[in-house]
Amino acid sequence: AITEAREEAKPYPLFPGPFPGSLQTDHTPLLSLPHASGYQPALMFSPTQPGRPHTGNVAIPQVTSVESKPLPPLAFKHTVGHIILSEHKGVKFNCSISVPNIYQDTTISWWKDGKELLGAHHAITQFYPDDEVTAIIASFSITSVQRSDNGSYICKMKINNEEIVSDPIYIEVQGLPHFTKQPESMNVTRNTAFNLTCQAVGPPEPVNIFWVQNSSRVNEQPEKSPSVLTVPGLTEMAVFSCEAHNDKGLTVSKGVQINIKAIPSPPTEVSIRNSTAHSILISWVPGFDGYSPFRNCSIQVKEADPLSNGSVMIFNTSALPHLYQIKQLQALANYSIGVSCMNEIGWSAVSPWILASTTEGAPSVAPLNVTVFLNESSDNVDIRWMKPPTKQQDGELVGYRISHVWQSAGISKELLEEVGQNGSRARISVQVHNATCTVRIAAVTRGGVGPFSDPVKIFIPAHGWVDYAPSSTPAPGNADPVLII
């Protein structure tokens, strides 16, 4: 590539008309500088010191009177207009002009496709002074042409703020076809048509395309580039490529794999991240996606207890973030969990079933049928109850917590008692006479304290009253019972 500077469009040339002369082209570079080494300043040979190169503008001796005689129009000599060569060959082309010695401060620059070639890559300007004119030959050489060197080259000379422009020299670098569009890898549905595109350019043109599937040519007759191959459908993975042919030879595109979308593989890992009494947090590593993005996943949960009815709970979730909290589980229960994910084709097989357990929780229900009565002879309150259903204990029962609140005129105090798990009755001492005692009971497991039963109230009279009847847990919707003895 060549360092370039943009220029606004300027009119062509100042001095129109036919100009005699010829331009030499030489495929041997005058100066061999590496193509990639950057651009050297233009090398110029001064008329006064012919053998010694220097850089900068050409200094031409001043003439005191420009009006002393009429000057001929200045123009670059005609040269070859079109050079065709193969990639990596060398090329050298010139433009030449004869400039009367009265002109001063002349500079020649090279331009390609409207952009100045700064640093004048491999450019040499030579001067051949005579009595009245100086012949200037500007040579441009490229040691190993590339496609990027294709284009229209011109010389420009500035004299007294006027610009003289040469005829263009078209450089056409020919080589093997160059792909501008290659087929792309695709994931396709089985037996569904799809298109592949291939485009290549010269020069030289035309470029013809052959398609190749799994190392065998698809089309017997070539198609002009660009070419679109319509594949009616595949049943298994295939590799496609295209061959681009021109007069210089053949270029083969990259081979692209066309995959057939399939159901995904099951997850390769499932992790139990955390368990609570009623939930299990799991994560998973998805398996192979079957060449189609995962859409969502399904977590299947069944009780591992052999006596369970074997029903499966299904929880659907998005494919990301491969994490799900399974809720609404029973406490202290064993579960089998399987994970399956789906893409547009269908569901994967379920992962191998894994085992997970919920932890103990606090009971979810209170003790039932709470009954309270006063035993005046011993000055105690007797409490009886039934333990909550096993299923709703949510763990191994370790005991009960009894709350009893004593209220009399202006005084209220709450006391808590702990009772071992074997009992279903308790006796508490009367704390205050002539007061109301409110009793509530909760079941306790290692997972915590469950809800308290509905309050049962009993009135404790002053000393000497007769023990009359028990108070018990009210039926739903009834007011709290208060037994006054």
Epitope: P267, T268, E269, R273, P352
Partner: antibody, heavy 128, light 111 residues
Framework: EQQLVESGGGLIQPGGSLRLSCAVS????????MSWVRQAPGKGLEWIGI???????YSASWAKGRFTISKDSSKNTMYLQMNSLRAEDTAVYFC??????????????????????WGQGTLVTVSS | DAQLTQSPSTLSASVGDRVTITCQSS????????LSWYQQKPGKPPKLLIY???DLASGVPSRFSGSGSGTEFTLTISSLQPDDFATYYC???????????FGGGTKVEIK
Amino acid sequence: EQQLVESGGGLIQPGGSLRLSCAVSGFSLSSNAMSWVRQAPGKGLEWIGIISSSGSTYSASWAKGRFTISKDSSKNTMYLQMNSLRAEDTAVYFCARVGFFVGYGAYDYGIIHRLDLWGQGTLVTVSS
Amino acid sequence: DAQLTQSPSTLSASVGDRVTITCQSSKSIYNNNWLSWYQQKPGKPPKLLIYDASDLASGVPSRFSGSGSGTEFTLTISSLQPDDFATYYCAGGYSGDSDYAFGGGTKVEIK
């Protein structure tokens, strides 16, 4: 094609260290757990340890302390670092893909379901 | 540590024979069925034959079958073929333990 290739085996003196590699192709170490298994000459298979897709490692009780499993997912390669080698460590060392793995993060253990793809193995000889 | 015991350790049989190998675990296998069977030929790595006690791995001929649950498992080759002479290993995992245990192996040789 899915493939496992072990390397790094050879003759090593007792007390020495060696690092074995298992180069994986055709699938990703970030999607699969991997395991090392060894087989002494003329003997049965012996499990060494596992590295999960996330990088958690679990080892056989006899291997803890001397053998360390690691991986470089960017290179799709798993390693087995073996220290303080003894004559009884002489064996062919296989790497294998874990077809499915369940991890119990809270309890720091995991269970292999199956080993569904094996490398050809690399021989380690511990001898003076 | 849990142990898997295979029997017999060596088995002589002829082509066409029905062959049965047993694998006994000292405690229940994880999920009662996470037991696999592997085939190994001399100088080669093991190859997965059966997983989940009875599921055939991909590409394994249907003459191989597995059964069992908990602690007792069986591998059966319904009609022994020349390619089946090899050593067979059972392997499995256990709850609460990362160790993956292999049985001692059963060598099936030509009678």
